[in-house]
Amino acid sequence: SWMWNQFFLLEEYTGSDYQYVGKLHSDQDRGDGSLKYILSGDGAGDLFIINENTGDIQATKRLDREEKPVYILRAQAINRRTGRPVEPESEFIIKIHDINDNEPIFTKEVYTATVPEMSDVGTFVVQVTATDADDPTYGNSAKVVYSILQGQPYFSVESETGIIKTALLNMDRENREQYQVVIQAKDMGGQMGGLSGTTTVNITLTDVNDNPPRFPQSTYQFKTPESSPPGTPIGRIKASDADVGENAEIEYSITDGEGLDMFDVITDQETQEGIITVKKLLDFEKKKVYTLKVEASNPYVEPRFLYLGPFKDSATVRIVVEDVDEPPVFSKLAYILQIREDAQINTTIGSVTAQDPDAARNPVKYSVDRHTDMDRIFNIDSGNGSIFTSKLLDRETLLWHNITVIATEINNPKQSSRVPLYIKVLDVNDNAPEFAEFYETFVCEKAKADQLIQTLHAVDKDDPYSGHQFSFSLAPEAASGSNFTIQDNKDNTAGILTRKNGYNRHEMSTYLLPVVISDNDYPVQSSTGTVTVRVCACDHHGNMQSCHAEALIHPTGLSTGA
């Protein structure tokens, strides 16, 4: 039977001779050279050689456990004479024995990590890992211990885990943002003689909101013309915040001051500036200076830093409203005046007033826009704004006159404004009533007395306040001995009645009746109108059959039967 144990061989042998491994030996070997030892398997004949007579095995080359820790070979013992095995072929192992010939190597040459600024001591930053190729199962060649070579007192490393933690309180990004930490990994449990490797860890402190916004000055002053429309930007203010990104975002607000309703502040979404804007129309003559209290605050606040104080700051903004030369302002948006139509030329109707709203109170002059009064019916006193007539009026021609008056600053004619004037012409009884139409009627020869032969209507161009009241009568010269009578119906109509029984068209074919129509206003106006009455032959129904030679102009619908 074979007589050996497992063979052990120290790696990295540096001697000048071959390294002795061990001896293969069969109990059948009498030492007379009759047996031959043969080696096969991993590295046989190359790495490992055997003395075929003695069974001594030697390593011809320097071996590296980290390259190959175990070699499996086969041993044979044969009878030289017969060539037959005296032992069954057997497998055996050469185990390479570790020496500490490898330093720990980190998984990365450079690590990058971040940790929030102001973190508590002991906050996890990153874990570094180093591996050692030596045998972890034997001795301490692969037992790695971590230590910090650079980066104290800011950071520490756990010796066994490689976990890097913060080691200093209140590390402030605004003070210092970047740290380069050098970590060493040493084998042999960190003991003397151990091999070591290092890595660099670049640590960046990330921002937290630990700084409030701060105005660089306590007071700002801006100017804006009073004519600035709502929405106009008038100035920018900027609070600075040492933080970055979201933590440096600033919201501005107006918290106090007389300008609270007149101005607004918005945040420029790109530059984080506060833009003061006009909110309502300004008036230099009402208020020349406004004071605002503007607050800058962080919209996102971390409660754990509130102990540092409020995350906001205030500044005073003084806004000076600048005067703008404004046109005159009329006392009314429109004027309504009235005048009787019988007014004489140069009669004053009323007046307009306009004032320069500016502090200078420049004097104004008045004029009529002639495009609105082409016939020059009206005029205005350029100094006091009195409106007067320059021509006679007639309500019946034009009831309303719509004109425009212009007020112009004497010192600055470019500054002018306009106002509409609505002038109503009041009625005066200066028109007599007249027949509403031309009346020509007929009477039947056989007509009876008191028959209605025509109803009369009148019109009047005037427009009395209480309405028209007309009266009708025969003219005095026709009143006595007339063949017809006028009956006033008291409703602004009158009837023509026959006064006798029967008319003879051969005696008198046509009657002309002068009728006086009067109104009831002051002064009374009257006119005389003539009604033509023809005498006609009629049938028994009272329908006209024939008249005098001339035909009637308006015969339709007229009959004695009315």
């Epitope: 709502p230 929405g231 930007p233 918005i266 945040t267 420029d268 979404q269 790109e270 530059t271 984080q272 833009i275």
Partner: antibody, heavy 121, light 107 residues
Framework: EVQLVESGGGLVQPGGSLRLSCAAS????????MNWVRQAPGKGLEWVAR??????????YYADSVTDRFTISRDDSKNSLYLQMNSLKTEDTAVYYC????????????WGQGTLVTVSS | DIQLTQSPSSLSASVGDRVTITCSAS???????LHWYQQKPGKSPKLLIY???YLASGVPLRFSGSGSGTDFTLTISSLQPEDFATYYC????????FGQGTKLEIK
């Protein structure tokens, strides 16, 4: 006077690329975020992309419909805005406007005349 | 994403009419972030009202804006011939979004 002049539009096949440019003048380009907005023929307005200012690390934002295909960029030294359009689709056919916000970077106050991009085979 | 819904989508009106267009946001937004635009055919959009209330430069006083939270309104007090156009609302929170538009036509 604020002026925005777009160029680079034209006819391109589906899957093709095009680069639009916008030359800006009359204002301080470096203090404004800039946008591209498009309008397909007969359709409404659609925001495409925005790029912020240097202070904000030139952060970019895109409409879902163009993410991973379009890239907005700017060259502050040249007062220019760009839109690189790759993997173009027929539905990208539109007039593309270069747009500057109002003061404070609100709204879309100033628009270029637009440049027509037609994607068709 | 904040969706904006305009109402009505189209509207016929006459010169002199008072017109109101509403814009409803899917979630509450600051009035600072809501704006209105006018666009005429073949032209670039034009800022009309910014930050909900303020008239952009050169915009006539007949235009006004109001609202807060989720409901915003554009009003034209007396329509003029040049007001016939398409109107859009828009909000500023990324991703920026527009309403679908309201086309104002002559009756």
């Amino acid at each position: 006077e604020v002026q925005l002049v777009e160029s680079g539009g034209g006819l391109v096949q589906p899957g093709g690329s095009l680069r639009l440019s916008c030359a800006a003048s009359g204002f301080t380009f470096t203090t404004y975020a800039m946008n591209w907005v498009r309008q397909a023929p007969g359709k409404g307005l659609e925001w495409v992309a925005r790029i912020r200012i240097k202070n904000n690390n030139y952060a970019t934002y895109y409409a879902d419909s163009v993410t991973d295909r379009f890239t907005i960029s700017r060259d502050d030294s040249k007062n220019s805005l760009y839109l690189q359009m790759n993997s173009l689709k027929t539905e990208d056919t539109a007039v593309y406007y270069c747009v500057r916000p109002d003061y404070g970077n609100y709204g879309l106050a100033y628009w270029g005349q637009g440049t027509l991009v037609t994607v068709s085979s | 994403d904040i969706q904006l819904t305009q109402s009505p989508s189209s509207l016929s009106a006459s010169v002199g009419d008072r017109v109101t267009i509403t814009c409803s946001a899917s979630s509450s937004i600051s009035s600072h972030y809501l704006h209105w635009y006018q666009q005429k055919p073949g032209k670039s959009p034009k800022l009309l009202i910014y930050r909900s209330f303020y008239l952009a430069s050169g915009v006539p006083l007949r235009f006004s804006g109001s609202g807060s939270g989720t409901d915003f309104t554009l009003t034209i007090s007396s329509l003029q011939p040049e007001d016939f156009a398409t109107y859009y609302c828009q909000q500023d929170i990324v991703p920026l979004t527009f309403g679908q538009g309201t086309k104002l036509e002559i009756k």
